[in-house]
Amino acid sequence: ILGGREAEAHARPYMASVQVNGEHLCGGVLVAEQWVLSAAHCLEDAADGKVQVLLGAHSLSQPEPSKRLYDVLRAVPHPDSRPDTIDHDLLLLQLSEKATLGPAVRPLPWQRVDRDVEPGTLCDVAGWGIVSHAGRRPDRLQHVLLPVLDRATCNRRTHHDGAITQRMMCAESNRRDSCKGDSGGPLVCGGVLEGVVTSGSRVCGNRKKPGIYTRVASYAAWIDSVLA
């Protein structure tokens, strides 16, 4: 997270850290007792490592009563996701068991109405991704409020040049932005999950390269079918 600040501890009980061999790789969001939503591209970086999900965390390194690491029973990338595109960049991870819910671990309601968020709406993004262009990684969860950017502007030739489909949304990236390591994390508008940070190798914090987020409402049927 660039241009953000430390999040209120455990105020985002839906926040997950997708880890490989004990190291944070991507963000994720608890959407049901046994399911975490993240980005499909995160799995590519996992290679053959052991994928686990950390819930109830604020600090990645310090002991916290609510923290628990879950093994992954099943990883379900969207069937149309591809390594060479950010289209359909969603991944569902089934935990080895139902998460123990409490004040610091709770699923987040996700948007089912397939309608664009109004441009200018301030949405919350959180993650353990890098906090500087030098690549500094935070130990504690960071967050930032970002305004939603209209798709037409995002698709300008000078910006993402038509790459943003109806199933994606953009947010401003002018010095405040999501970045490497935040992929798979939640974009929350009005307390509801609207988007998931895509995991392309986009430059961060450059206003001409807005953040790209996969719109969860556009994938409601797929999410429901996997969770069923």
Epitope: P119, G120, D124, E172
Partner: antibody
Amino acid sequence: EVQLQQSGPELVKPGASVKISCKASDNSFTGYYMHWVKQSHGNILDWIGYIDPYNGVSSYNQKFKGKATLTVDKSSSTAYMEIRSLTSEDSAVYYCASYYGSSPYWYFDVWGTGTTVTVSS
Amino acid sequence: QIVLSQSPAILSASPGEKVTMTCRASSSVSYMHWYQQKPGSSPKPWIYATSNLASGVPARFSGSGSGTSHFLTISRLEAEDAATYFCQQWSSNPYTFGGGTKLEIK
């Protein structure tokens, strides 16, 4: 606790412009969006827009586009709102407001002292 | 834009009574905020995200609701509760406020 101190009351003529200020008491001014709200007679609250002091990004309620302009001076931790082409409809109390918390459920947890603008010939 | 309608516009009740005011939205709002304002003062945050009390708000206040209907309830009214209460949605730009409920103490 952060405080937002606004400039004093203004009596202005129709057609003129007015620029009101909102000074934050702490030095983390650039970390937080500054919103402006109009309270008309009859107590109606209208959100005007916001500006991000960190990067200058702003967003306006369509109703106030062309009427209000939001700016900031980072060096003095002050936000400004200019209202132009004033009419009697613009007579109101104007508040700056911000969210200084860090939960995902942002709201206006700090409000300015309010500036009364009276438009009269 | 999302239009918020508050009712009643004026609510008159006696100390010790339980009172409830309503905020209805023209389209679904997952969470609602509430502010208290007394004459001559700036609004104060009162309840955020539907049911969370802002700092310093007495426990006799509570918030509830979902979708298009949200409520602010005072379990036992006290004289100091006399004020106007505004609801506000933050789901969508432009952020909108209700017209307010003025609470008067008999």
